[in-house]
């Protein structure tokens, strides 16, 4: 006869490990007992359990409640056991010793491998601002056994660097993603992808990039100066900019207070029916936590009685 077992048994943390030990005997041969022991500890073998043909399963105190026989139906030549709820410390070498009649004793050895799936974490780097050089966008760390693979999935151009820390029974892998921030990256996904044999599918953690910036400001509404004449209704100036975080707008008049009746509505300055007192230099002030911008325009309200048009100056300042 001979023993059938596996060289390696692989389970995921928390699963039950079946340790196989089947005696393939000739007809009439019987298995009297099967002793299971862990044998990679330097100070001696550690008994798991003893399966006795007459007296059943006897689990050692060290493995109380953790070793069972596989569910019925059971073959009397099958000395396999289940190690319940495998933990990382169970990883190691095991042997079964089978006492048979009349063929004598046989033994087999196997390695139990316990996969510890990683629980990845993604940490965003410092705030990204347009104009910075190469900056850490995010780091992703995953610890497991064996060491997990950590990669990045993104449309954003950048560079990655990885480092690994070995612990007694696991390894932690950290990957960093660096980039040169630009406004085009804003809102783009940066996904950390963790692969591991203990995972049914890759784990993905997505971080949305936020790049602080503030675009140059400009004012729209004076494209056709001839429309700015006394009595016109619905005249308005709109301040154009964009930024992250979204900017706030403030309107002032450089050569005095805003005329009465002029309405400020965020980025828009609304005028009542135009009069000459609305002529002047208007400043749009755009700001966010990152920066501020100004744009000023000169409004010259025309008197329709006059023939000659007047030049309009558009000045933009940062």
């Amino acid at each position: 006869g001979e023993l059938e077992t596996s060289d390696v048994v692989t389970v995921v943390l928390g699963q039950d490990a079946k340790l196989p030990c089947f005696y393939r005997g000739d007809s009439g041969e019987q298995v009297g007992q099967v002793a299971w022991a862990r044998v990679d500890a330097g100070e001696g073998a550690q008994e798991l359990a003893l399966l006795h043909s007459k007296y059943g399963l006897h689990v050692s105190p060290a493995y109380e409640g953790r070793v069972e026989q596989p569910p019925p139906p059971r073959n009397p030549l099958d000395g396999s056991v289940l190690l319940r709820n495998a933990v990382q410390a169970d990883e190691g070498e095991y042997e079964c010793r089978v006492s048979t009649f009349p063929a004598g004793s046989f033994q087999a050895r196997l390695r139990l491998r316990v996969l510890v799936p990683p629980l990845p974490s993604l940490n965003p780097g410092p705030a990204l601002e347009e104009g910075q050089g190469l900056t850490l966008a995010a780091s992703c760390t995953a610890e497991g056994s064996p060491a997990p693979s950590v990669t990045w999935d993104t449309e954003v151009k950048g560079t990655t660097s990885s480092r690994s820390f070995k612990h007694s029974r696991s390894a932690a892998v950290t990957s960093e993603f660096h980039l040169v921030p630009s406004r085009s990256m804003n809102g783009q996904p940066l996904t950390c992808v963790v692969s591991h044999p203990g995972l049914l599918q890759d784990q993905r953690i997505t971080h949305i990039l936020h790049v602080s910036f503030l675009a140059e400001a400009s004012v729209r509404g004076l494209e056709d100066q001839n429309l700015w004449h006394i009595g016109r209704e619905g005249a308005m100036l709109k301040c154009l900019s964009e930024g992250q975080p979204p900017p706030s707008y403030n309107w002032t008049r450089l050569d005095g207070p805003l005329p009465s009746g002029v309405r400020v509505d965020g980025d828009t300055l609304g005028f009542p029916p135009l009069t000459t007192e609305h002529s002047g230099i208007y400043v749009c002030h755009v700001s966010n936590e990152f920066s501020s911008r100004d744009s000023q325009v000169t409004v010259d309200v025309l008197d329709p009685q006059e023939d000659s048009g007047k030049q309009v100056d558009l000045v933009s300042a940062s």
Epitope: A45, E93, S105
Partner: antibody, heavy 117, light 111 residues
Framework: EVQLQQSGPDLVKPGASVKISCKAS????????MHWVKQSRGKGLEWIGR????????LYNQKFRGKAILTVDKSSSTAYMELRSLTSDDSAVYYC??????????WGQGTLVTVSA | DIVLTQSPASLAVSLGQRATISCRAS??????????MHWYQQKPGQPPKLLIK???NLESGVPARFIGSGSGTDFTLNIHPVEEEDTATYYC?????????FGGGTKLEIK
């Protein structure tokens, strides 16, 4: 310090029973098998059986099945061996021993049982 | 059951000389990992004391003059140099399977 303290010598009549105790101290009682060994006068050592202090599960040498009954009292960290239907062949020194990874690293001092009319 | 045969049953060795005790098992008690054979010393009126476990591993506190060797079925306990205090009976024991058994013992006398 691991200690196994056995009960004192016993003189019993043939056909009677005797219960020997083995009180463990200096370690977690439920973490190790307790074995019992017989040594007849001038003779060698015979393994009687073992008990798992966690649950009281026992395994016996077939020769002593029905003769010896092994039990434990977890609350007092004490193992017991009862010997039944005693005959002169049962006169011997009986030892309890704690198993450490398949070897008997700690032994009680022994209990002499004398069966005599 | 596995039968352990010890020889000699008794021996007398001069102080400082070598004592050699043999133990033969009726079947192998070794795997690729461990040999399930142990040696005990018993002095009169005392319980046995573990000397060597797994055929060759000296138990903590035991003098290095005690040396165990062997695997499979043939095992040897050597004591060299013997000292007066080594007067005792020595037993081999296997823990390969149930029932565990002991050898018949070897009584060592120091001349």
């Amino acid at each position: 310090e691991v200690q196994l303290q056995q009960s004192g010598p016993d003189l019993v009549k043939p056909g009677a029973s005797v219960k020997i105790s083995c009180k463990a101290s200096g370690y977690s009682f439920t973490d190790y098998y307790m074995h019992w060994v017989k040594q007849s006068r001038g003779k060698g050592l015979e393994w009687i059986g073992r008990v798992n202090p966690n649950n009281g599960n026992t395994l016996y040498n077939q020769k002593f099945r029905g003769k010896a009954i092994l039990t434990v009292d977890k609350s007092s960290s004490t193992a017991y061996m009862e010997l039944r239907s005693l005959t002169s062949d049962d006169s011997a020194v009986y030892y309890c021993a704690r198993e450490d990874r398949y070897a008997f690293a700690y032994w009680g001092q022994g209990t002499l049982v004398t069966v005599s009319a | 059951d596995i039968v352990l045969t010890q020889s000699p049953a008794s021996l007398a060795v001069s102080l400082g000389q070598r004592a050699t005790i043999s133990c033969r098992a009726s079947q192998s008690v070794s795997t690729s990992s461990y040999t399930y054979m142990h040696w005990y010393q018993q002095k009169p009126g005392q319980p046995p004391k573990l000397l060597i476990k797994y055929a060759s591993n000296l138990e903590s506190g035991v003098p290095a003059r005690f040396i165990g060797s062997g695997s499979g079925t043939d095992f040897t306990l050597n004591i060299h140099p013997v000292e007066e205090e080594d007067t005792a009976t020595y037993y081999c024991q296997h823990t390969w399977e149930i029932p565990y058994t002991f050898g018949g013992g070897t009584k060592l006398e120091i001349k």
